[in-house]
């Protein structure tokens, strides 16, 4: 069985989470991509998605989440600005490919947001800036209601968190165990 890894991000309130999911561009360049949260004991919930078909380098904004799909580069950029403690959770990037199961991109991200802004330079933060200027050309895409025996996604809520990841794709039916990887700080 394919082992699903998990990367842990530890950030402070107010910081920006800025990540990439990489995918096989030959297969999925124009496919619709989505950012999901997985709550304990629940099915994945879609927080934001790209348009269908996904437009190249065209930002889509849902609340504090911004998705930008770079077709030429096989990369989906996921940003979440002004992180809140409540944004803590487990996230994943998926590719919609109806009527088949969504494809999940390795690996999941465990986001831990703690109180108090850190001025220490580090990954995915805009120095001491809490305000992230959102590109003026963003649009909001409608996410499909997608139900399957293993996966349920819903329309995006008003406020959520983001994070994503790269590496490779696996079909959600292949998910078995989760391996935790170390935190790099």
């Amino acid at each position: 069985a394919t082992k699903l890894t998990e990367e842990k991000y530890e950030l402070k309130e107010g910081q920006t989470l800025d990540v990439k999911c990489d995918y096989t561009l030959e297969k999925f360049a124009s496919s619709q991509k989505a950012w999901q949260i997985i709550r304990d004991g629940e099915m994945p919930k879609t927080l934001a998605c790209t348009e269908r078909p996904s437009k190249n380098s065209h930002p889509v904004q849902v609340g504090r989440i911004i998705l930008e799909d770079y077709h030429d580069h096989g990369l989906l950029r996921v940003r979440m600005v002004n992180l809140q403690v409540e944004d803590s959770g487990l996230y994943q990037c998926v590719i919609y490919q109806p009527p088949k199961e969504p494809h999940m991109l390795f690996d999941r991200i465990r986001l831990v947001v703690t109180k108090g802004f850190s001025g220490t330079p580090g990954s995915n933060e805009n120095s001491t800036q809490n305000v992230y200027k959102i590109p003026p050309t963003t649009t909001k895409a409608l996410c499909p209601l997608y139900t399957s025996p293993r996966t349920v996604t819903q329309a995006p809520p008003k406020s959520t968190a983001d994070v994503s990841t790269p590496d490779s794709e696996i079909n959600l039916t292949n998910v078995t165990d989760i391996i935790r990887v170390p935190v790099f700080n």
């Epitope: 990367e7 800025d18 561009l25 380098s57 580069h73 990954s123 805009n126 120095s127 590496d167």
Partner: antibody
Framework: QVQLVQSGAEVKKPGASVKVSCKAS????????INWVRQATGQGLEWMGW????????GYVKKFQGRVTMTRDTSISTAYMELSSLRSEDTAVYYC?????????????????WGRGTLVTVSS | DTQMTQSPSSLSASVGDRVTITCQAS??????LNWYQEKPGKAPKLLIY???NLETGVPSRFSGSGSGTDYTFTISSLQPEDIATYYC?????????FGGGTKVEIK
């Protein structure tokens, strides 16, 4: 020590292909994306694309699409960049560079480790 | 693509002088900017990342600042070993793009 060692200089004729290698040592090859950057004589730096050595995923700058192929052999910790249909303007030093990221999946494009470069000369 | 306009293209200064190089992006790059040093016959070396963070092992006389579309790289007190070409590189948008470079020489 931590380094990227590139293959030697090449002289090619227009229309031919060149394959440059980049061998990593001193770190886990599959943990960092490899990027390729070139510099024509007297010119600035130009990014060509990236590769995830763990899964083999790649992304290429539009200008090079259809002509460039980035591959790897994880068994020998080596990345490759092949450029086809060479023309005189492809004469340049080609660098491989490691993308450092505190978090593997973060949107950080800092190149903290570079090869010494491979000079590719295209001449008839 | 995001164009990076770097200036000046070259400069000559005395040892101990304060040297400033600027980079202007054609669109907002949200501090997603790095600075590299390239010496003749050698590979580029990362000096500053994410606009203002000093890379480990890099002397503190090097610094970076800026936001939005305008960024500045400063050498507070030029040393003989700083003779090189300096490049900015943005990653606020793909493709990644570099400035044209600034050649720094000693008077």
């Amino acid at each position: 020590q931590v380094q990227l060692v590139q293959s030697g200089a090449e002289v090619k004729k227009p229309g031919a292909s060149v394959k440059v290698s980049c061998k990593a040592s001193g770190y886990t090859f599959t943990s960092y994306d490899i990027n390729w950057v070139r510099q024509a004589t007297g010119q600035g730096l130009e990014w060509m694309g990236w590769m995830n050595p763990n899964r083999g995923n790649t992304g290429y700058v539009k200008k090079f699409q259809g002509r460039v192929t980035m591959t790897r052999d994880t068994s020998i910790s080596t990345a490759y960049m092949e450029l086809s249909s060479l023309r005189s303007e492809d004469t340049a030093v080609y660098y491989c560079a490691r993308r450092r990221a505190v978090y593997r999946s973060s949107w950080e494009w800092y190149f903290d480790l570079w090869g010494r470069g491979t000079l590719v000369t295209v001449s008839s | 693509d995001t164009q990076m306009t770097q200036s000046p293209s070259s400069l000559s200064a005395s040892v101990g002088d304060r040297v400033t190089i600027t980079c202007q992006a054609s669109q907002d790059i949200f501090n997603d900017l790095n600075w590299y040093q390239e010496k003749p016959g050698k590979a580029p070396k990362l000096l500053i990342y994410h606009a203002s963070n000093l890379e480990t092992g890099v002397p503190s006389r090097f610094s970076g600042s800026g936001s939005g579309t305008d960024y500045t790289f400063t050498i507070s007190s030029l040393q003989p070993e700083d003779i090189a070409t300096y490049y900015c590189q943005q990653y606020g948008n793909l493709p990644l793009t570099f400035g044209g470079g600034t050649k720094v020489e000693i008077k």
